[in-house]
Interface confidence: low
């Protein structure tokens, strides 16, 4: 992507770099994960060390709303974040080294779209450049995966089991075990983002307890084993 808006390009006796920006056409990631939007650039101001601003915007170039902005003081390699949409955007690259790569945390399906990087030199070499075609972020749904399953002490010398899974759409969780009615006793709550947690509040018998997570893309299961006659509960997945 070597197109953008070009202002006041300096002339040099030696051949100078032109403004250009390099971004991939597309980045794919699963909902709930993080993605990196790569962006590097070249510019004609060979030894520019003045103030600069790095910007990412969404939707459309030049006019789309900003999702990230940081500013570096003259001579500084630290780009101080001034805007990070809901705190989910973080600069990975070093703008002083021509790298504006951005990390997006906790992806949602709604994050799908086109993103545009931009750099502004605001010192003597007053200039700016922006990717015109941008990078397309495709956020895809995610099959379930169980991220934690455990047995914990409960009230009155009883035990309880917890199962946390993630996926998009958020998976439905179900417990099964040696005691009748265990699955119906599971308490399911909505967690953060794409994680859901189900609790089996009272494990009444020793044996294997299985947590199953399912959504439209698939299913996952994991088990814990309760052996109270061994003292502490043992777990296995």
């Amino acid at each position: 992507d070597a197109s953008g808006d070009l202002l006041n390009t300096e002339a040099h006796s030696a051949p100078a770099q032109r403004w250009s920006m390099q971004v991939p056409a597309e980045v794919n990631a699963e909902a709930g994960d993080a993605a990196v939007l790569p962006c590097t650039f070249t510019h004609p101001h060979r030894h520019y060390d003045g103030p600069l601003t790095a910007i990412w915007r969404s939707g459309e170039p030049y006019a789309g709303p900003q999702v990230f902005r940081c500013t570096a003081a003259p001579g500084s390699e630290l780009c101080q974040t001034a805007l990070s949409l809901h705190g989910r955007f973080r600069l990975l690259g070093n703008p002083r080294r021509n790298d504006l790569s951005l990390r997006v945390e906790r992806l949602a399906l709604a994050d799908s779209g086109r993103y545009f990087c931009r750099v502004e030199f605001t010192g003597d070499a007053h200039d700016r450049y922006e990717s015109r075609h941008g990078v397309r972020l495709r956020v895809t749904a995610a099959a379930p995966r169980i991220v934690n399953i455990s047995v914990l002490p409960g009230p009155a010398h009883a035990f309880r089991a917890l199962c946390t899974a993630e996926g998009e759409p958020p998976p439905a969780l179900a417990w099964s075990g040696p005691a009748p009615g265990n699955s119906s006793a599971a308490l399911q709550g909505q967690g953060h983002g794409y994680q859901v947690t189900a609790e089996l509040p009272a494990l009444t018998r020793d044996g294997r307890y299985t947590c199953t997570a399912a959504n439209s893309l698939g299913r996952a299961e994991a088990s814990v084993y309760l052996f109270r006659f061994h003292g502490a509960p043992g777990t296995s997945t």
Partner: antibody, heavy 122, light 107 residues
């Protein structure tokens, strides 16, 4: 002063047309997505349409798709809603609203106009 | 479309009371939820965005919480000017949708 000012409402017969305008001031208009939201008498809020800051992307509620057109003139700091084939159920106060400044697809509305009444009746 | 359901539809309370309004989405909307206050004959006013961020200029007695499908707006100590109708709105996906509103009335 940061504000939005709607105009163009009025009484129109079913099947008729109206063009609403929303004049913006006090902020960089072209940097923000803008929307129309309506409220029928005694009812709740209903999102109608959104347009991106540069005008390249537009979105509509199913109830108005094909009949309403959102547009903007960034040189005049003005948002428009062209309403054709109006129906009795389009009767409402129409508000223009500014996106808070996050992504166009994930925004709250932090600035609203005072609203303009559209009545569709024979 | 994502349906937003508010409860209660109306609530009576007194100045100084703590009031909680809930909003439930028909599917996971992460934290893409806003709360608005509207008084009769006036435009809505943004109170909370991204589920829990307080809009500039809004008193700190207003707070929002929740993520996924269940959200809460809390007014810690009601003031006379807080009696109004409150709406939640999801901005996870287009079409944006609002709750049906909760009318907060003086007891």
């Amino acid at each position: 002063e940061v504000q939005l000012l709607e105009s163009g409402g009025g009484l129109v017969q079913p099947g008729g047309s109206l063009r609403l305008s929303c004049a913006a001031s006090g902020f960089t208009f072209s940097s923000y997505a803008m929307s129309w939201v309506r409220q029928a008498p005694g009812k709740g809020l209903e999102w109608v349409s959104t347009i991106s800051g540069g005008g390249g992307s537009t979105y509509y509620a199913d109830s108005v798709k094909g009949r309403f057109t959102i547009s903007r003139d960034n040189s005049k700091n003005t948002l428009y809603l062209q309403m054709n084939s109006l129906r009795a159920e389009d009767t409402a106060v129409y508000y223009c609203a500014k996106a808070i400044g996050s992504s166009w697809y994930s925004d709250a509305f932090d600035l609203w106009g005072q609203g303009t009444m559209v009545t569709v009746s024979s | 479309d994502i349906q937003m359901t508010q409860s209660p539809s109306s609530v009576s309370a007194s100045v100084g009371d703590r009031v909680t309004i809930t909003c439930r989405a028909s599917q996971d909307i992460s934290s893409w939820l806003a709360w608005y206050q509207q008084k009769p004959g006036k435009a809505p006013k943004l109170l909370i965005y991204v589920a829990s961020s307080l809009q500039s200029g809004v008193p700190s007695r207003f707070s929002g919480s929740g993520s996924g499908t269940d959200f809460t707006l809390t007014i810690s100590s009601l003031q006379p000017e807080d009696f109004a109708t409150y709406y939640c709105q999801q901005s996870y996906s287009i079409p944006y949708t609002f709750g049906q509103g909760t009318k907060l009335e003086i007891k």
